[in-house]
C-alpha cells in the first residue's frame, strides 16, 4: 500500500494552559523507519516528538505506537504556552543500514494557534 | 456556483484607510477559511492575510501585520480587510479567495477590487 | 519562509506547442504545491494542487508533476485561451503562504 501521511486539520485553536491533541495517521508502516514530530520546517525546525522511547516533556503518544499495525501517530501537547505556536509536522523516514535515516514523506502540517487564557 | 465578489475598492492618499468586503454566495461560507491575497501592477501574488471559518484563527502577511484587520461575519457570508495606514506599495488589486477544506490552497477567488494609494 | 522561483519568466510558443513551465522552491514542500492560471480581467483559477492532481473541470492538457523542491506544469498542445501568466504556491511551509513570480505563456 502507498504510504501516505495524513495530518486532518489544517489548524487548532488551544487557550494558554490547556491540552491540544495533533492528529497523524499513516496508510502503511512501511518501509521501516521512525516517525517524528517537528515543528517548523528547514534548518530551524525543531524535534516535538519521536515515536522512538525518548521522553519529551508535555508531549505524549495519544495511542500504543507499540501495538502491532498501530496506524495512529498523534501526539498531546499539554500545558500550551504561547511559545508552542507554530505548524507541526509529522514525518516519516526510511532507516539506513548505516547512514542516517531519510526523510520520506510528511504531514500537510496543522498550525497550532495559542489563544489568550480567558480571564 | 461558488461566487465571490469583492467591494469596496479606490484612491486613497497614504496613511488613509479603506475597507474591502467579500460577498460569499453558493457554498456553506462558515465552514471555509478564507484569505486575501494582492497583486500590486506589474508584480506577481502577495498573500496578504488568512481567516479561519470560525474567525478566531487569523495571520498575516508581516508586510500588512499591525495596519490591516481581516474579519467575517459568516451571517451575512461576508468577508472584511480592514486597511489603515495605508502605504503607496499597497497599491494591488486585491483578491478574495475559499480556501480548500483539506489544505491552504484556493479553490476559488473573486475578480479582485483594485486599491490605489496615491498622494 | 520558503521562496519559490519560477523559470522561464516569459515563453514564446505557438497553438499546438508543448509548454513546460518550472517553479523550484528553497526548500522541501514534498507534493504541497499548487499551480493556478491568471488572465487580465477574470478571477485566477486552480488548475493543479498536491502537484499532480487536477482541479476539477480542468482539460487533461494541462498535467503537474514534480516532489520535494522541483516541480513542473506542462500543457500537453497549446490552445489560444491557455495564453496567460501562471503561478505556482506553496502551503506547506506556513504561514506565510507563498507564491512564484509567475511565467507569462505568450503567443510567438
Known amino acids: 500500500k502507498e504510504l501516505k501521511v495524513t495530518q486532518p486539520e489544517k489548524s487548532v485553536s488551544v487557550a494558554a494552559g490547556d491540552s491540544t491533541v495533533l492528529n497523524c495517521t499513516l496508510t502503511s508502516l512501511l518501509p521501516v523507519g521512525p516517525i517524528k514530530w517537528y515543528r517548523g520546517v528547514g534548518q530551524s525546525r525543531l524535534l516535538i516528538y519521536s515515536f522512538t522511547g525518548e521522553h519529551f516533556p508535555r508531549v505524549t503518544n495519544v495511542s500504543d505506537a507499540t501495538k502491532r499495525n498501530n496506524m495512529d501517530f498523534s501526539i498531546r501537547i499539554s500545558n500550551v504556552t504561547p511559545e508552542d505556536a507554530g505548524t507541526y509536522y509529522c514525518v516519516k523516514f526510511q532507516k539506513g543500514p548505516s547512514e542516517p535515516d531519510t526523510e520520506i514523506q510528511s504531514g500537510g502540517g496543522t498550525e497550532v494557534y495559542v489563544l489568550a487564557k480567558p480571564s | 456556483d461558488v461566487q465571490l465578489v469583492e467591494s469596496g475598492g479606490g484612491v486613497v492618499r497614504p496613511g488613509e484607510s479603506l475597507r474591502l468586503s467579500c460577498a460569499a454566495s453558493?457554498?456553506?461560507?462558515?465552514?471555509?477559511?478564507m484569505n486575501w491575497v494582492r497583486q500590486a501592477p506589474g508584480e506577481g501574488l502577495e498573500w496578504v492575510s488568512l481567516?479561519?471559518?470560525?474567525?478566531?484563527?487569523?495571520y498575516y502577511a508581516d508586510s500588512v501585520k499591525g495596519r490591516f484587520t481581516i474579519s467575517r461575519d459568516n451571517s451575512k457570508n461576508t468577508l472584511y480587510l480592514q486597511m489603515n495606514s495605508l502605504r503607496a506599495e499597497d497599491t494591488a488589486v486585491y483578491y478574495c479567495?475559499?480556501?480548500?477544506?483539506?489544505?491552504?490552497?484556493?479553490?476559488?477567488w473573486g475578480l479582485g477590487t483594485l486599491v490605489t494609494v496615491s498622494s | 519562509e520558503t521562496v519559490l522561483t519560477q523559470s522561464p519568466g516569459t515563453l514564446s510558443l505557438s497553438p499546438g506547442e508543448r509548454a513546460t513551465l518550472n517553479c523550484r522552491a528553497s526548500?522541501?514542500?514534498?507534493?504541497?504545491l499548487a499551480w493556478y492560471q491568471e488572465k487580465p480581467g477574470q478571477a485566477p483559477r486552480l488548475l493543479i494542487y498536491?502537484?499532480?492532481s487536477r482541479a476539477t473541470g480542468i482539460p487533461d492538457r494541462f498535467s503537474g508533476s514534480g516532489s520535494g523542491t522541483e516541480f513542473t506544469l506542462t500543457i500537453s498542445s497549446l490552445e489560444s485561451e491557455d495564453f496567460a501568466v501562471y503561478y505556482c504556491?506553496?502551503?506547506?511551509?506556513?504561514?506565510?503562504?507563498?507564491f512564484g513570480g509567475g511565467t507569462k505563456v505568450e503567443i510567438k
Open positions: 479567495a475559499k480556501e480548500n477544506n483539506r489544505y491552504r490552497f484556493f479553490d476559488y
Open positions: 453558493g457554498f456553506t461560507f462558515s465552514s471555509y477559511d
Open positions: 498536491d502537484a499532480s
Open positions: 481567516i479561519s471559518g470560525s474567525g478566531e484563527i487569523i
Open positions: 526548500q522541501s514542500v514534498y507534493t504541497y
Open positions: 504556491q506553496q502551503y506547506y511551509d506556513r504561514p506565510p503562504l507563498t
